[in-house]
C-alpha cells in the first residue's frame, strides 16, 4: 500500500489522543534503557509502510503484536485516513485470525514496541532536509529526502 | 531518570568559537533527537537546531546556518553544540533539550550554559 | 518563518482567579502547539504539547486549547507556585518558533 495520500495530521492526532498511551501502558515496567532503535523512516508516507509492518506482520519471537490494543487502533486509523487502505488489508486479517490467539509478551515484543514508539516519533515530527522552505508538513514530505 | 548535564559557563573572545557539550543518561541516547535552544538575557527562547543521535541527521535554523555545527558522540551519550565567528549578540544561556516519547515537545532540557561573548 | 505572538505580555493576577494567555501564529500552524513554564534562573519546563495534552505530572488546573492560528493557554486557579514565564511554541514547520513569553505575576 502507497502511503503518499493519507491524511497525515488526522494520523497524528489519533496517535497522540489514544495510541501514544496504549504504547506506553505496554511498555510499563521496561527500562528506557534497555533497546536502541534501529528501525528508522525518513518521510511520513514510509514511516507509516514501517509502521504497518512492524505492528501487522508477525516476526520471529513477537507473533501477536496485531491483536494489542494499540495495533487495533493504529489499523483503524490507518483504514479512516489512507484511501483505499481497507480493500488492501483483507487477506492480512485472514492471516491475522490464523495467528495464535493468546496475547504473549515476549522481550522481543517489547523490543518492537520500542521499535514502534520510535517510528511514531519520526512521522509525528520528520527531520528534514531543508530544502526552500525547510518544512516537514503533511504535503511536502513526498518531496524531501532524509538529511546526511 | 533521564538527565541532560551541561558544561561550565564560557567567556569568549569576538570571532572565536565556542563547544558545549550536553552529556545525557537514563535512556537510551540515541533513540530521541536533541534539541538546541538559546536564552538572550532577559529575551525569549530562539531554537538553534536539532540532531538525531542516532544518525546524525541534522536540521539548523537559517539563522544560525553555517555558524552552528551540531554532532553527537553516541559512545559517550554526549551532544555538542559548536558556535563559531562569535558576536556580543550570542551572549546568551544555551540549552540543550530532549525530544519527547511522542516527537511533539521538548521534555528534558539541560541545567544551561552561559556563553559570554566580550572583547 | 512562523512568528508566534503572545498576548499580554505580561499580566497580573489574584491568587486563586484564572489567568489566561493567547499566543496567535502567522500561519496555521494545525495543532502543533507546546506550552512551557519557565522560573527565574531555571530550565524551561514543558506543560502541554499538541494543543491540550497534560505532560505527565502536570496539574489539572493547566490547560489548552485552540487550533490553526489561535490558541489559548489557561491556569484556572492560579497559584502561588505558578509565577513565572510562559512560552508557546510551534513544531509545525521548520524553523520552531517560540512566542516572546508572558510574565504572569501575582496581583
Known amino acids: 500500500y502507497d502511503f503518499t495520500n493519507c491524511d497525515f495530521e488526522k494520523i497524528k492526532a489519533a496517535y497522540l489522543s489514544t495510541i501514544s498511551k496504549d504504547l506506553i501502558t505496554y511498555m510499563s515496567g521496561t527500562k528506557s534503557t534497555e533497546f536502541n532503535n534501529t528501525v528508522s523512516c525518513s518521510n511520513r508516507p514510509h514511516c507509516l509502510t514501517e509502521i504497518q509492518s512492524l505492528t501487522f506482520n508477525p516476526t520471529a519471537g513477537c507473533a501477536s503484536l496485531a491483536k494489542e490494543m494499540f495495533a487495533m487502533k493504529t489499523k483503524a486509523a490507518l483504514a479512516i485516513w489512507c484511501p483505499g487502505y481497507s480493500e488492501t488489508q483483507i487477506n492480512a486479517t485472514q492471516a491475522m485470525k490464523k495467528a495464535r490467539k493468546s496475547k504473549v509478551t515476549t522481550n522481543k515484543c517489547l523490543e518492537q514496541v520500542s521499535q514502534l514508539q520510535g517510528l511514531w516519533r519520526r512521522f509525528n515530527r520528520p527531520l528534514l532536509k531543508q530544502q526552500g522552505s525547510s518544512d516537514y508538513k503533511d504535503d511536502d514530505d513526498k518531496h524531501h529526502h532524509h538529511h546526511h | 531518570e533521564v538527565q541532560l548535564v551541561q558544561s561550565g559557563a564560557e567567556v569568549k573572545k569576538p570571532g572565536s568559537s565556542v563547544k558545549v557539550s550536553c552529556k545525557a543518561s537514563?535512556?537510551?541516547?540515541?533513540?530521541?533527537?536533541i534539541e538546541w535552544v538559546r536564552q538572550a538575557p532577559g529575551q525569549g527562547l530562539e531554537w538553534i537546531g536539532v540532531?538525531?543521535?542516532?544518525?546524525?541527521?541534522?536540521n539548523y535554523n537559517e539563522n544560525f546556518k553555517g555558524r552552528a555545527t551540531l554532532t553527537a558522540d553516541k559512545s559517550t551519550s554526549t551532544a555538542y553544540m559548536e558556535l563559531s565567528s562569535l558576536r556580543s549578540e550570542d551572549t546568551a544561556v544555551y540549552y540543550c533539550?530532549?525530544?519527547?516519547?511522542?516527537?511533539?515537545?521538548?521534555?528534558?532540557w539541560g541545567q544551561g550554559t552561559t556563553v559570554t561573548v566580550s572583547s | 518563518d512562523i512568528v508566534m505572538t503572545q498576548s499580554p505580555d505580561s499580566l497580573a493576577v489574584s491568587l486563586g482567579e484564572r489567568a489566561t494567555i493567547n499566543c496567535k501564529a502567522s500561519q496555521s500552524v494545525s495543532s502543533d502547539v507546546t506550552w512551557y513554564q519557565q522560573k527565574p534562573g531555571q530550565s524551561p519546563k514543558l506543560l502541554i504539547y499538541y494543543v491540550s495534552n497534560h505532560y505527565t505530572g502536570v496539574p489539572d488546573r493547566f490547560s489548552g486549547s485552540g487550533s490553526g492560528t489561535d490558541f489559548t493557554f489557561t491556569i484556572s486557579s492560579l497559584q502561588a507556585e505558578d509565577v513565572a514565564v510562559y512560552y508557546c511554541?510551534?513544531?509545525?514547520?521548520?524553523?520552531?518558533?517560540f512566542g516572546q513569553g508572558t510574565k504572569l505575576e501575582i496581583k
Open positions: 511554541q510551534q513544531h509545525h514547520r521548520f524553523p520552531l518558533t
Open positions: 537514563g535512556y537510551a541516547f540515541s533513540n530521541y533527537l
Open positions: 533539550a530532549r525530544e519527547d516519547n511522542t516527537g511533539t515537545a521538548f521534555d528534558y
Open positions: 540532531i538525531d543521535p542516532g544518525n546524525g541527521d541534522t
